[in-house]
């Protein structure tokens, strides 16, 4: 014969567990129905009564199947300098993660506490590690025959033009000035290491390879400096 | 708490070296390049070099490129400044000092270091 | 290398006056300036950066401007407290201190 269906409540068997979405009741001694996600027990069972549920109030949310009185209440609302990645509905709780420039220095559960503009690097500095959802970036000196004139947090150092006749040596924030002779960026695609450009001031010692630029990139000419906004900060 | 501890006074004699440490804590050591400053008695500050405790690489003051070696070990998270050949001269405080590379240098330094050199 | 001309040298005011120090740089540091105090027998400590931006705990008299080669520094409201040393830093290209500004209290 077919084992008998037991409908909520009822009482398991000694030393035998209630089955998937139900919960033991202590007061009632049975096994009962959970609430679904979305809603929530607004009267629990008792031997002869199953639990009876209720939608979660706006604001509010259960993500599991549970037995709780009342919904959780959603997080506050995403910061300025936060956007929301999930909405607060009946079944889950609002996300707030960190906008474009900016990554999580605290973070919570889910989502982000606190957000921090990432670093931009000053002129002479490139970006050796990029910033990522979870840490900023890390700002490195440009190695000697390399350069950066911008302030950002992503820009890497980039090889000086390679001069036939120099009229300004490169150093670490501005790039080579040639004669009018049209210059060269050599950079082979897959290189390890920097060449060594022409007549160039060796802006520091540097006994490995270039940390903050990356072989195989293809450069642009340069641009002006574009230091940042009166105020902004870096951190 | 970042913090930049820095060894005890020093005295050289002159022709000797010295070498200075630098113990940093707080934050990650090789994400950011450490600064040596010089302070001779009763005087203003003056800019050594620095030295990238990831990379081991350096750049120095032309006025101190053959006085100053910088170094840095990561296993210890300290960085080193050694003072060759020391005269008069080099009589003074010296300080390190981190560089994020980005709008804030020097935001922490050490206590400072006083070197004397006497015969 | 960039030069940096800090003056005056040293600074005698009254309690409550407004002060202002002054540095030129060499050449064009696109703002790349910095202020700190020094008290004797302790290291510096960073008041502004980034020509105006004040560090976290620098109170609000003190303030900084500034663009191309010239660059000010001020205390609105001079306490006792401020008496120091004040020195100048470009940091665009390399590092250059001014030669600093002593202030002290009519």
């Known amino acids: 014969l077919p084992a008998q269906v037991a409908f909520t409540p009822y009482a398991p068997e000694p030393g035998g567990t209630c089955r998937l979405r139900e919960y033991y009741d202590q007061t009632a001694q049975m096994c009962c129905s959970k609430c679904p996600p979305g809603q929530h027990a607004k009267v629990f069972c008792t031997k002869t009564s199953d639990t009876v549920c209720d939608s979660c109030e706006d604001s509010t949310y259960t993500q599991l199947w549970n037995w709780v009185p009342e919904c959780l209440s959603c997080g506050s609302r995403c910061s300025s300098d936060q956007v929301e990645t999930q909405a607060c509905t009946r079944e889950q709780n609002r996300i707030c993660t960190c906008r474009p420039g900016w990554y999580c220095a605290l973070s919570k559960q889910e989502g982000c506490r606190l957000c921090a503009q990432l670093r931009k690097c000053r002129p002479g500095f490139g970006v050796a590690r990029p910033g990522t959802e979870t840490s900023d970036v890390v700002c490195k000196p440009c190695a000697p025959g390399t350069f950066s004139n911008t302030t950002s947090s992503t820009d890497i150092c980039r090889p000086h033009q390679i001069c036939h006749v120099v009229a300004i040596p490169g150093n670490a924030s501005m790039d080579a000035v040639c004669t009018s002779t049209s210059p060269t960026r050599s950079m082979a695609p897959g290189a390890v290491h920097l060449p060594q450009p022409v007549s160039t001031r060796s802006q520091h010692t540097q006994p490995t390879p270039a940390p903050s630029t990356a072989p195989g990139t293809s450069f642009l000419l340069p641009v002006g400096p574009s230091p940042p906004a009166e105020g902004s900060t870096g951190d | 708490e970042v913090q930049l501890q820095q060894s005890g006074p020093e005295v050289g004699r002159p022709g000797s070296s010295v070498k200075i440490s630098c113990k940093a804590s707080g934050y990650t050591f090789t994400d950011y390049i450490m600064h040596w400053v010089k302070q001779s008695p009763g005087q203003g500050l003056e800019w050594i070099g620095w030295v990238d405790p990831e990379y081991g690489s350096t750049d120095y003051a032309e006025k101190f490129k053959k006085k100053a070696t910088l170094t840095a070990d990561t296993s210890s998270n300290t960085a080193y400044i050694q003072l060759s050949s020391l005269t008069s001269e080099d009589t003074a405080t010296y300080f390190c000092?981190?560089?994020?590379?980005?709008?804030?240098?020097?935001?922490?330094w050490g206590q400072g270091v006083m070197v004397t050199v006497s015969s | 290398d960039i030069q940096m001309t800090q003056s005056p040298p040293s600074l005698s005011a009254s309690l409550g006056d407004k002060v202002t120090i002054t540095c030129q740089a060499s050449?064009?540091?696109?703002?790349?300036i910095a202020w700190y105090q020094q008290k004797p027998g302790k290291a510096p400590r960073l008041l502004i950066r980034y020509t105006s931006t004040l560090e976290s705990g620098t109170p609000s008299r003190f303030s900084g401007s500034g663009s191309g080669r010239d660059y000010s520094f001020s205390i609105s409201n001079v306490e006792s407290e401020d008496i120091a040393s004040y020195y100048c830093l470009q940091y665009v290209n390399l590092l250059t201190f001014g030669a600093g500004t002593k202030l002290e209290i009519k």
């Open positions: 050449q064009n540091i696109n703002k790349y």
């Open positions: 000092a981190r560089d994020d590379g980005s709008y804030s240098p020097f935001d922490y």
